[in-house]
């Protein structure tokens, strides 16, 4: 008799999830000497322990504590780059500007980036068919709780000037419901963080508008200012040129506005 299985609205666990997490861990610890002490089998066991045999709508931050402990990692608190809805450019930037870090440049972020996972209550199986969708099913699902937990810690770690890359092509350049808007903004520590500097990335070639005047950016400025953190904003009109100038700052064309 086939066993009844809960059908969720979201995609199932990424295929070869255990192998992917383990392989990523090994690769990361090989590339980053300061993390060579990490036992990747223990990391996988802790990751698995956070969601296996648990109801995928009843996951808590506590479930991820053993994994968080194994993934302890010092990041330069004044070199943190947050992003919202523009992950690829943020990652391209930190690949060039090697002294700056997105969450996905840390071990924990690297392990889980672009992956989906969930289990089932009272069985040791991973659910490859479907996983809960944040909106349609429940917010306390394994993926959402993981990102909320690590994003909160990442924001709490930040100091001095924190940068955030925002997508100027979206209708809501700053979205209160994004991870940045709902978690990271509220966990920046005013005693440590002096300024949040937003980089609004333009999409259109001929787009010369000042998107720093966008109502959602003004909303972000208001939230940040109320938290006693200064706010500044820059338009990045030419993201391609921006990246090129990060690579080659001496280039003569890099003195003009980008």
């Amino acid at each position: 008799v086939p066993r009844w299985r809960q059908q969720w609205s979201g995609p199932g666990t990424t295929k070869r999830f255990p192998e992917t997490v383990l392989a990523r861990c090994v690769k990361y610890t090989e590339i980053h000497p300061e993390m060579r002490h990490v036992d990747c089998q223990s990391v996988w066991d802790a990751f698995k322990g956070a969601f296996i045999s648990k109801h995928p709508c009843n996951i808590t931050e506590e479930d991820y504590q053993p994994l968080m402990k194994l993934g302890t990692q010092t990041v330069p608190c004044n070199k943190i780059l947050l992003w919202s809805r523009i992950k690829d450019l943020a990652h391209q930037f930190t690949q060039v500007q090697r002294d700056m870090f997105t969450l996905e440049d840390t071990l924990l972020g690297y392990l889980a980036d672009d992956l989906t996972w969930c289990g089932e209550f009272n069985t040791s199986k991973i659910n490859y068919q479907s996983c809960p969708d944040w909106r349609k099913d429940c917010s306390n699902n394994p993926v959402s709780v993981f990102w909320k937990t690590v994003s909160r810690r990442f924001a709490e770690a930040a100091c001095d000037v924190v940068h955030v890359m925002l997508n100027g092509s979206r209708s809501k350049i700053f979205d209160k419901n994004s991870t940045f808007g709902s978690v990271e903004v509220h966990n920046l520590q005013p005693e440590k963080v002096q300024t949040l500097e937003a980089w609004v990335i333009h999409g259109g070639r001929e787009d010369s508008r000042d998107l720093c005047q966008d109502p959602t950016i003004k909303e972000l400025e208001s939230i940040i200012s109320k938290r006693n953190i200064q706010f500044s904003c820059k338009n990045i009109y030419r993201p391609d040129k921006f990246l090129q100038c990060v690579k080659n700052p001496e280039d003569s064309s890099c003195t003009s506005e980008i």
Partner: nanobody, 124 residues
Framework: QLQLQESGPGLVKPSETLSLTCTVS??????????WGWIRQPPGKRLELIGS???????YYNPSLKSRVTISVDTSKNQLSLKLSSVTAADTAIYYC????????????????RGQGTLVTVSS
């Protein structure tokens, strides 16, 4: 619940070494669950990180103070210490010791626990 209490002289002469101690209660200073640091706030200015020390003994010092600072722990006394040499009037501040949870991504500035602070004045 962790509690931190700073102690040390309230007055230090210019060019001398400032020495402060922080006694930790409610938890072990040698636990891998925490990292520790010193912060200061000069009159009318923002808080400034002096430096921090991690489980295993590695340290981070604010580049602007690096040549003058030493932070260490005494596990037998459950204490954190700060030494700041060659002080000037610019080192006059309230000095705080601080503790932070040591899991996931962590920075150099522990901010989960903080002592009451102790005022140190540099004057002859």
């Amino acid at each position: 619940q962790l509690q931190l209490q700073e102690s040390g002289p309230g007055l230090v002469k210019p060019s001398e070494t400032l020495s402060l101690t922080c006694t930790v209660s409610g938890g072990s200073i040698s636990s891998s669950s925490y990292y520790w640091g010193w912060i200061r706030q000069p009159p009318g200015k923002r808080l400034e990180l002096i430096g921090s020390i991690y489980y295993g003994g590695s340290t981070y010092y604010n580049p602007s103070l690096k040549s003058r600072v030493t932070i260490s722990v005494d596990t037998s006394k459950n204490q954190l210490s700060l030494k700041l040499s060659s002080v000037t009037a610019a080192d006059t501040a309230i000095y705080y010791c601080a503790g932070g949870y040591n899991y996931g991504p962590v920075g150099q500035w522990p901010s989960d626990y903080r002592g009451q602070g102790t005022l140190v004045t540099v004057s002859s």
